[in-house]
């Protein structure tokens, strides 16, 4: 007998063809011999089956000797053997209906687990293979689990159910809730305004929750809260803010913080957490601030950086358009009795200058 796979909630069309290309009498029955539907001349008749209001046929095809059974809004319990009786013949079709659902919300926090559950008719032994938007394949039986969801797992998951060498495909849209970047570094000269941005990697109709930025200054022995805020329908409102520094926060997404001045005492690392309504767990983004200061005190020209820098970074002092006078993989460099002119302090790595500060040294008379 023919096997047809269907998806829960979908519509299926079971075919039945007579050898005569004309409208003749036919009946569709289930395995209990209960009539589902048939015809009487050109009229569609329905039997007492539980499919009554969901079963139909295509009258336009009867004249061609085709008598399909259409079942709408499929249910797992519709899985059965359906018999088409026409011209003293019986055509049997086995219908197997499957359902695949995410057994939690389809909006999940980065790092959480996704579990997909397969609903299948009794007696079936399907296999399932799912492919994530980034090409990851997972296989299983009745349940499939993916732990530690990543940002790249956002999108349409395509799952193929295989039974009796037939396939049916499901598509499930998953949204991974995360910040666009796990970590970022801002390099600033002393006194410059600092902009911290925390763009989200997803869009939802309504976004409600609360957040906080904790800051660990390089010079401080412990971390402290800098700001707490609420998020209501994508509108940001500050609940509490420290007096030093005087942070300002944007009222709209993306989350945006402004530090009026980069100062050595603020250099360090921050952790912004966002707790979303009806979600367990929090979103995190690390942000780092590196501050540079160039100063001249009497006969000493000094350049210093504060904050979380890689030990590979080079700090240099050079007179404009000349070779570096001093370069060290350290956080402070200096030149004694500097020549007059425009001096540059440079923080650089193998690929670029990350931060630059100019200081004018006046001639000593």
């Amino acid at each position: 007998k023919k096997v047809v796979l269907g998806k829960k909630g979908d519509t299926v069309e079971l075919t039945c063809t007579a050898s005569q290309k004309k409208s003749i009498q036919f009946h569709w029955k289930n395995s209990n011999q209960i009539k589902i539907l048939g015809n009487q001349g050109s009229f569609l008749t329905k039997g007492p089956s539980k499919l009554n209001d969901r079963a139909d046929s295509r009258r336009s095809l009867w004249d061609q000797g085709n008598f399909p059974l259409i079942i709408k809004n499929l249910k797992i319990e519709d899985s059965d053997t359906y018999i088409c009786e026409v011209e003293d013949q019986k055509e049997e079709v086995q219908l197997l209906v499957f359902g695949l659902t995410a057994n939690s919300d389809t909006h999940l926090l980065q790092g959480q687990s996704l579990t997909l559950t397969l609903e299948s008719p009794p007696g079936s032994s399907p296999s399932v293979q799912c492919r994530s938007p980034r090409g990851k394949n997972i296989q299983g039986g009745k349940t499939l689990s993916v732990s530690q969801l990543e940002l790249q797992d956002s999108g349409t998951w395509t799952c193929t159910v295989l039974q009796n060498q037939k396939k049916v495909e499901f598509k499930i849209d998953i949204v991974v809730l995360a910040f666009q970047k796990a970590s970022s570094i801002v390099y600033k000269k002393e006194g410059e305004q600092v902009e911290f941005s925390f763009p989200l990697a997803f869009t939802v109709e309504k976004l409600t929750g609360s957040g906080e930025l904790w800051w660990q200054a390089e010079r401080a022995s412990s971390s402290k809260s800098w700001i707490t805020f609420d998020l209501k329908n994508k509108e940001v409102s500050v609940k509490w803010v420290t007096q030093d520094p005087k942070l300002q926060m944007g009222k709209k997404l993306p989350l945006h913080l402004t530090l009026p001045q980069a100062l050595p005492q603020y250099a360090g690392s921050g952790n912004l957490t966002l707790a979303l309504e009806a979600k367990t767990g929090k979103l995190h983004q690390e942000v780092n601030l590196v501050v540079m200061r160039a100063t001249q005190l009497q006969k000493n020209l000094t350049c210093e950086v504060w904050g979380p820098t890689s030990p590979k970074l080079m700090l240099s002092l050079k007179l404009e358009n000349k070779e570096a006078k001093v370069s060290k993989r350290e956080k402070a460099v200096w030149v004694l009795n500097p020549e007059a002119g425009m001096w540059q302090c440079l923080l650089s790595d193998s690929g670029q200058v990350l931060l630059e500060s100019n200081i004018k040294v006046l001639p000593t008379w």
Partner: antibody
């Protein structure tokens, strides 16, 4: 497309010198740090040296310090490795590789050449 | 200089297996660690950078984790093309140093 092609390998006697070249194409060579990495026959990878984007800084593995010199000519999009006082243990395939440096935080060698073979033997 | 100790030095596994390779640094390297794959006669290929960032075009069955001194490369479900030698590289400070490699063979 982005490409690195090494040349200059060959058979050389111990104590002699050899200069390897690495021709870069398909990217702005002067914006990247560049490495030499080597692999002795049947052995693992060994980092040799790095030169910064502007040639201002160079760092070496202890095993080659004082004998090898890394240099670059940004106008010719070419990286060099001058190898002096060669020893049998310098026999290896020499690869050049591009270093990506992002935000002074993320570093990686994303593009590699196919390698050139250096054999030091009497 | 920072020493990198990779283990195991060789590993036999089957297609579909989950495989873990570890790398230990002789001192704290924060998250300055990358993983490279090399096949015989070929140049190394970048898989993971800065501990856990998947390089563009690398299959998501590869993942990296760790921080400080202990790091892990995990292949969630081995594919035939994954049989190769894997190296960790500390790029936290100069001189850079590779681990001695892990040869992944078919069981």
């Amino acid at each position: 497309q982005v490409q690195l092609v090494e040349s200059g390998g060959g058979v050389v006697q111990p104590g002699r010198a050899l200069r390897l070249s690495c021709a870069a194409s398909g990217f702005t060579f002067s914006s990247y740090g560049m490495h030499w990495v080597r692999q002795a026959p049947g052995k693992g990878l060994e980092w040799v040296a790095i030169i910064w984007y502007d040639g201002s800084n160079k760092y070496y593995a202890d095993s080659v310090k004082g004998r090898f010199t890394i240099s670059r000519d940004n106008s010719k999009n070419t990286l060099y490795l001058q190898m002096n006082s060669l020893r049998a243990e310098d026999t290896a395939v020499y690869y050049c590789a591009r270093e990506v440096a992002l935000e002074g935080y993320y570093y990686y060698m994303d593009v590699w050449g196919k390698g050139t073979t250096v054999t030091v033997s009497s | 200089d920072i020493q990198m100790t990779q283990s195991p030095s060789s590993l036999s596994a089957s297609v579909g297996d989950r495989v873990t390779i570890t790398c230990r640094a002789s001192q704290d390297i924060r998250n300055g660690l990358g993983w490279y794959q090399q096949k015989p006669g070929k140049a190394p290929k970048l898989l993971i950078y800065t501990t856990s960032n998947l390089q563009s075009g690398v299959p998501s069955r590869f993942s990296g984790s760790g921080s400080g001194t202990d790091f892990t490369l995990t292949i969630s479900s081995l594919q035939p093309e994954d049989f190769a030698t894997y190296y960790c590289l500390q790029d936290y400070n100069y001189p850079y140093t590779f681990g001695q490699g892990t040869k992944l063979e078919i069981k």
